[in-house]
Interface confidence: medium
């Protein structure tokens, strides 16, 4: 029997195809087999299907890189990674697409999802779309809709001050931050570590913490798949 | 727990100067931007400047601008309002208020308040 | 400068009942919207703030919701310390802005 998806566009198309176990898969963008791209396959997380595109769990990977870095993506996909802007923009451009955060620290958890989420082409420095939020962890991530991505080297932020080089990370940042995923690990100075702020507050740095996303209509996809 | 003590208002003849202070405590000052809101006697809030928490970033709304200036001491733990040119309209009770972070947010936390009154 | 636009500007209201302030803002301010609650002779309180979030120490029978430009303040059940002046506020944008106030009194 062949595949449902022979070239999987995205982490619910290879779950589609019957991949149930969370690790690293081959996508194809806008499935051109031309195209691959590596990436982790987070297939348990409610219902799984997610394309993990940050991870920060130890503090192994320095994040405090240059715009090049953020563009392309960097790390080791099965510990502390960035996927890389090109490829996010790439793959939300291919539909319509929902952000899953997931946060741990000592036995904590949270959670935020955003169910339509995209980031711009290179021309509009990769610029954050995230509305309709649910989920445990607060609605942080609104306060940086529509915003550019920002590094020390490329400040696109609203501050007179550059925020990347004040928080030594980078992000959709606006004035400065509510979110600061890409901060400093560990550190516990106020608005330096790993931030959400609706969660931990500017003065904690969380241990754990995943973006991912998948199709906004996977619910309906997996149903079909079901029935077949 | 945090304070916030304003002081410096008082009564001045319209065209004149005056300063208002701010000294705050309980919390790490310069963590935090901080507010200026003001309320005619009667009437609503209206929110008249802002500063980030380096100092680096000032804000101000349409009716003060250029006429009222905001900073502010971090080795004092001290915000300022300087209030040159001022006007009947700007009698006000003055609130100085903390942000709920260090960027232009949220005033979370309030001061009483110090009153300003113009009038010839 | 965006308008923030509240009603009731007055509403008399029995304990116990439940209260609805609207905020309308008079363009798209995302979620950024801000209640306060003032009493007679006092400094305003931070009630909520980023439309939904409950300030820490306040009791959970105020809530709030809404997002673009229209924002709702509740209080699922009033109480006698409830009577107060309620003030919406945008923070989106400098200068930030704030409505007109809402009275809640006795009825």
């Known amino acids: 029997i062949g595949l449902l998806y022979p070239f999987p566009r995205d982490c619910s198309q290879a779950m589609l195809n019957g991949d149930t176990t969370s690790g690293l898969y081959t996508i194809y963008i806008n499935g051109d087999k031309t195209q691959a791209l590596e990436v982790y396959c987070d297939m348990t997380s409610d219902g799984g299907g997610w394309i993990v595109f940050l991870r920060r769990k130890n503090g192994r990977e320095d994040f405090y890189r240059n715009w090049k870095a953020y563009a392309a993506g960097f790390g080791d996909r099965r510990e502390e990674f960035w996927l890389g802007l090109d490829n996010l923009s790439k793959i939300t451009a291919q539909g319509q697409y929902e952000l899953r955060v997931d946060l741990q620290d000592h036995g904590e958890s949270a959670y935020a999802v955003y169910d339509r989420f995209s980031v711009g082409d290179a021309k509009s420095r990769y610029k954050l779309k995230v509305e309709g939020y649910s989920g445990t962890a607060g609605d942080s991530m609104n306060y940086h809709n529509g915003r550019s991505f920002s590094t020390y080297d490329k400040d696109t932020d609203s501050a007179i001050t550059n925020c990347a080089l004040s928080y030594k990370g980078a992000f959709w940042y606006k004035n400065c931050h509510r979110v600061n995923l890409m901060g400093r690990y560990g550190d516990n100075n106020h608005s330096q570590g790993v931030n959400w702020f609706h969660w931990k507050g500017h003065e904690y740095s969380i241990q754990f913490a995943e973006m991912k996303l998948r199709p906004s209509n996977f619910r309906n996809l997996e149903g079909r798949r079901k029935r077949a | 727990q945090v304070q916030l003590v304003e002081s410096g208002g008082g009564l001045v003849q319209p065209g004149r100067s005056l300063r208002l202070s701010c000294a705050a405590s309980g919390f790490t000052f310069d963590d935090y931007a901080m507010h200026w809101v003001r309320q005619a006697p009667g009437k609503g809030l209206e929110w008249v400047s802002g500063i980030s928490g380096s100092g680096g970033s000032t804000y101000y709304a349409d009716s003060v601008k250029g006429r009222f200036t905001i900073s502010r001491d971090n080795a004092k733990n001290s915000l300022y309002l300087q209030m040159n040119s001022l006007r009947a309209e700007d009698t006000a009770l003055y609130y100085c208020?903390?942000?709920?972070?260090?960027?232009?947010?949220?005033?979370?936390?309030w001061g009483q308040g110090t009153m300003v009154t113009v009038s010839s | 400068d965006i308008q923030m636009t509240q009603s009731p500007a007055s509403l008399p209201t029995p304990v116990g009942d439940r209260v609805t302030i609207t905020c309308r803002a008079s363009?798209?301010?995302?979620?950024?919207l801000n209640w306060y609650q003032q009493k007679p002779g006092k400094a305003p309180k931070l009630l909520i703030y980023?439309?939904?979030n409950l300030e820490t120490g306040v009791p959970s029978r105020f809530s709030g919701s809404g997002s673009g430009t229209d924002f709702t303040l509740t209080i699922s059940s009033l109480q006698p310390e409830d009577f107060a002046t309620y003030y919406c506020q945008q923070s989106y944008s400098t200068p930030q802005t704030f409505g007109q106030g809402t009275k809640v009194d006795i009825k």
């Open positions: 208020a903390k942000d709920i972070s260090a960027v232009m947010d949220v005033p979370q936390t």
């Open positions: 363009q798209y301010i995302q979620g950024f």
């Open positions: 980023d439309a939904s």
